[in-house]
């Protein structure tokens, strides 16, 4: 049994990194491996985490970790049994992807604007909490060329915009996703997304 | 918004023993490595104990063996009970929050060894 | 055991003035584990500088940490009436635990 692709790790910069590798053959992850990580800290203790099976040769496993900080560096372990498979290490901050944004809602019943809101992902404790932006996507659900893309860069989790830029009488759906430039993250998941119909009173014209 | 609240300070002759609390919130204290840390009057700064997450513990030279720290993750609270006091013990005591720096401090309690 | 040793033991200088205070350290530490604190009378200490150079969360750009090794320094580029404290530095280690310089005051000329 030998590792083919070693294990690569992303962090939610919270509580939970998620490390996936792929062994050279077909494999019962839970059964046959077990990863052993340890915070290098005086204070820290070596934990197991079973690995779950993705796909046929592929194994993830999801590491429940304390509070991360930037100077955070683990200590990976592979086992299958009593042999060691593959040894690593993995710092936390370098590899973050931010958990997705939540509660996105479309709220309509302001005069001709669309309003956006949704919740910060981190709690204010957290780093990541201050630091992060947006990308809110909409798009139509009866045409797909109308697809837009905008970018929030403030840190307030909302977003206005004038009902007027989208097509009137249709409906729309939106979601949103995250990413904090400090650490240089990927993005995160998309949120689920929501829909609405959007419809608003077309200006008259004066000929 | 994270707070440390302590309690538990007082006077006590030496030989004697107090037990300090710290009650914790705005956080996830199960998740965060937890510390005392003591400042004798007019003096500096010094770290005395500290406990991990899954209840390592370690301890400044200075009070091995006579202190104990511990931590109840059900009641967010933290404890560090002193026996054995001597006179140089007496300080005002902080609890913290941090791993290798302490970011969050308790108000701290006075710890008073006087015969 | 490292041992931090702090200077000078008090800095007097006017408001408007550009505080250095120094930290030097018994032997190398990583800068990842080297942090400044605060301390006004009768108040509990408070995170500056975490990492040699970081602000802590809502510390002003006034401060800035610089460093590394065994030399460190903590920068206030022009000091607030509230900055008139003591200042101490504070360094972990994987076998000895956390230390503290002994600080330096910073006084009102």
């Known amino acids: 049994m030998k590792v083919l692709q070693e294990p690569t790790c992303v962090s939610d910069y919270m509580s939970i990194s998620t490390c996936e590798w792929k062994m050279n053959g077909p494999t019962n992850c839970s059964t046959e491996l077990r990863l052993l990580y340890q915070l290098v800290f005086l204070l820290s203790e070596a934990h197991t985490c079973i690995p779950e099976n993705n796909g046929g040769a592929g194994c993830v496993c999801h590491l429940l970790m304390d509070d991360v900080v930037s100077a955070d560096n683990y200590t990976l372990d592979l086992w299958a049994g009593q042999q060691l498979l593959w040894k690593g290490s993995f710092k936390p901050s370098e590899h973050v992807k931010p958990r997705a944004p939540g509660n996105l809602t479309v709220h309509t019943n302001v005069s001709d604007t669309l309003l956006l809101t949704w919740s910060n992902p981190y709690p204010p404790d957290n780093y990541l909490y201050n630091h992060l932006t947006y990308a809110v996507n909409i798009w139509s659900e009866n045409d797909p060329a109308d697809f837009r893309i905008y970018n929030v860069t403030y840190l307030e989790p909302s977003l206005r915009i004038a009902a007027s830029t989208l097509k009137s009488g249709i409906s729309y759906r939106a979601r949103v996703r995250a990413w904090a430039q400090c650490y240089n993250t990927t993005w995160s998941e998309w949120s689920p997304s929501t829909k609405w119909h959007n419809s608003y009173r077309e200006p008259f014209e004066q000929h | 918004e994270v707070q440390l609240v302590q309690s538990g300070g007082g006077l006590v002759h030496p030989g004697g023993s107090l037990r300090l609390s710290c009650a914790g919130s705005?956080?996830?204290?199960?998740?965060?490595?937890m510390f005392w840390v003591r400042q004798a009057p007019g003096k500096g700064l010094e770290w005395v104990s500290g406990?991990?997450?899954?209840?390592?513990?370690n301890y400044a030279d200075s009070v091995k063996g006579r202190f104990t720290i511990s931590r109840d993750n059900a009641k967010n609270s933290l404890y560090l009970q002193m026996n054995s006091l001597r006179a140089e013990d007496m300080a005002v005591y902080y609890c913290?929050?941090?791993?290798?720096?302490?970011?969050?401090w308790g108000q701290g309690t006075l710890v008073t060894v006087s015969s | 055991e490292i041992v931090l040793t702090q200077s000078p033991g008090t800095l007097s200088l006017s408001p408007g003035e550009r505080a250095t205070l120094s930290c030097r350290a018994s032997?190398?530490?990583?800068?990842?584990?080297l942090a400044w604190y605060q301390q006004k009378p009768g108040q509990a200490p408070r995170l500056l500088i975490f990492?040699?150079?970081s602000r802590a969360t809502g510390i002003p750009d006034r401060f800035s940490g610089s460093g590394s090794g065994t030399d460190f320094t903590l920068t206030i580029s022009r000091l607030e009436p509230e900055d008139f404290a003591v200042y101490y530095c504070?360094?972990?280690?994987?076998?000895?635990?956390?230390?503290f310089g002994q600080g330096t005051k910073v006084e009102i000329k």
């Open positions: 990492g040699a150079s």
């Open positions: 705005g956080f996830t204290f199960s998740r965060n490595a």
């Open positions: 406990i991990g997450t899954g209840g390592a513990t």
């Open positions: 504070q360094q972990y280690g994987s076998s000895a635990g956390w230390t």
């Open positions: 913290a929050r941090g791993r290798y720096y302490f970011d969050y």
């Open positions: 032997q190398s530490v990583s800068s990842s584990y």
